[in-house]
Interface confidence: low
């Protein structure tokens, strides 16, 4: 026997309470496939979430963030804090990175310096709070009489700022 | 001192249900999100969901989807779960925990002390 | 929903040894991984977050690492006090899953 409610549209929800009818989804409720027996409330964007897609009978909002946050999660479910390039963001807020370390972006943690000196290379230009140290030829290669930028102090280990 | 007092063990019957309290103190309710963690005897631990007071929005564990219910009151900072069509497999302890919302890294930085629930007949 | 598994599920340690216990995500969760640690009878209380950084009161014999889907926590000098259960959290997507736990006890 075919289950009546297998009838049923995505936007629409198998009444119960109604002999199985089926009733357009509620303002503020969506069901995005057929056959279904509820239909489920509708994603609210507030505070720091923004709309980016409004909610219809068929499909959820979706959020993202309001400037000076980012989407964090899947479908965006948290916001994080913006921090400027060169820091990272801690339970006190934005901090700068200790030195050793960068973040070239304004989400995500500091993280320390490439080591040029693991690929045989020379430090061609020196590490920033904001940017990567860049690795050059090996000593090797170059030309007698040739300097190099002086490398730069060992990276901290991940994990030390302040907290 | 932020605290999360949840309320006192439970022993219900098969197919019954029960609400689970978790009421928040020393900071602001609606800026973090109240997590469910679910730790049956001798276990590990599984997520349940998250609600945020704010708005009430919520995320499920697909495998609790029919088992629970969050919701909150935000007039006592007070965030509940109701566990529905109670089985066997539902006696465990059951911990709220929060995460704020601006910062992830914050996550399940305060633990209530625990609600024990025992199903039995 | 990503995978945590965690090894070993128990470990008998000597006091003073240093003991790691790793974690794998069946994906990659960006650092985005929490360690617990488990007393009898009490809430998880939470050591490490974002992979390496130390919860705020936690000794400094504790630390995380790895980065992708690998993660190790490392107690460099096991005490009394720390015999527990650790899990491991990650939380880059949701649902947030855990490890099955290690159970850690003095030889």
């Known amino acids: 026997l075919q289950d009546p409610c297998s009838n049923c549209p995505a936007g629409t929800f198998c009444d119960n309470n109604r002999n199985q009818i089926c009733s357009p989804c509620p303002p503020n409720s969506f069901s995005s496939a057929g056959g279904q027996r509820t239909c489920d409330i509708c994603r609210q964007c507030k505070g720091v979430f923004r709309t980016r897609k409004e909610c219809s009978s068929t499909s959820n909002a979706e959020c993202d963030c309001t400037p000076g946050f980012h989407c964090l999660g899947a479908g965006c479910s948290m916001c994080e804090q913006d921090c400027k390039q060169g820091q990272e963001l801690t339970k006190k807020g934005c901090k700068d990175c200790c030195f050793g370390t960068f973040n070239d972006q304004k989400r995500g943690i500091c993280r320390p310096w490439t080591n040029c000196s693991l690929d045989g290379k020379s430090v061609l230009v020196n590490g920033t709070k904001e940017r990567d140290v860049v690795c050059g030829p090996s000593p090797a290669d170059l030309s007698p009489g040739a300097s190099s930028v002086t490398p730069p102090a060992p990276a901290r280990e991940p994990g030390h700022s302040p907290q | 001192q932020v605290q999360l007092v949840q309320s006192g063990a439970e022993v219900k019957k098969p197919g019954s249900s029960v609400k689970l309290s978790c009421k928040a103190s020393g900071y602001t309710f609606s800026s973090y999100w109240i997590n469910w963690v679910k730790q049956a005897p001798g276990q590990g631990l599984e997520w349940i969901g998250n609600?945020?007071?704010?708005?009430?929005?919520?995320n499920y564990n697909q495998k609790f989807k029919d088992k629970a219910t969050l919701t909150v009151d935000k007039s006592t900072s007070t965030a509940y779960m109701e566990l529905s069509s109670l089985r066997s497999e539902d006696t465990a302890v059951y911990y709220c925990?929060?995460?704020?919302?601006?910062?992830?890294?914050?996550?399940?930085?305060?633990w209530g002390q625990g609600t024990t629930l025992t199903v039995s007949s | 929903d990503i995978q945590m598994t965690q090894s070993p599920s128990s470990l008998s340690a000597s006091l003073g040894e240093r003991v790691t216990i790793t974690c794998k995500a069946s994906?990659?969760?960006?650092?985005?991984l929490s360690w617990f640690q488990q007393k009898p009878g009490k809430a998880p209380k939470t050591l490490i977050y974002r992979a390496n950084r130390l919860v705020d009161g936690v000794p400094s014999r504790f630390s995380g690492s790895g980065s992708g889907q690998d993660y190790t926590l490392t107690i460099s000098s096991l005490q009394p006090e720390d015999i527990a259960t650790y899990y491991c959290l990650q939380y880059d997507e949701l649902p947030p899953t855990f490890g099955g736990g290690t159970k850690l006890e003095i030889k």
């Open positions: 994906q990659d969760i960006n650092s985005y």
């Open positions: 925990t929060r995460t704020w919302e601006f910062y992830y890294d914050s996550v399940f930085d305060y």
């Open positions: 609600i945020y007071p704010s708005d009430s929005y919520t």
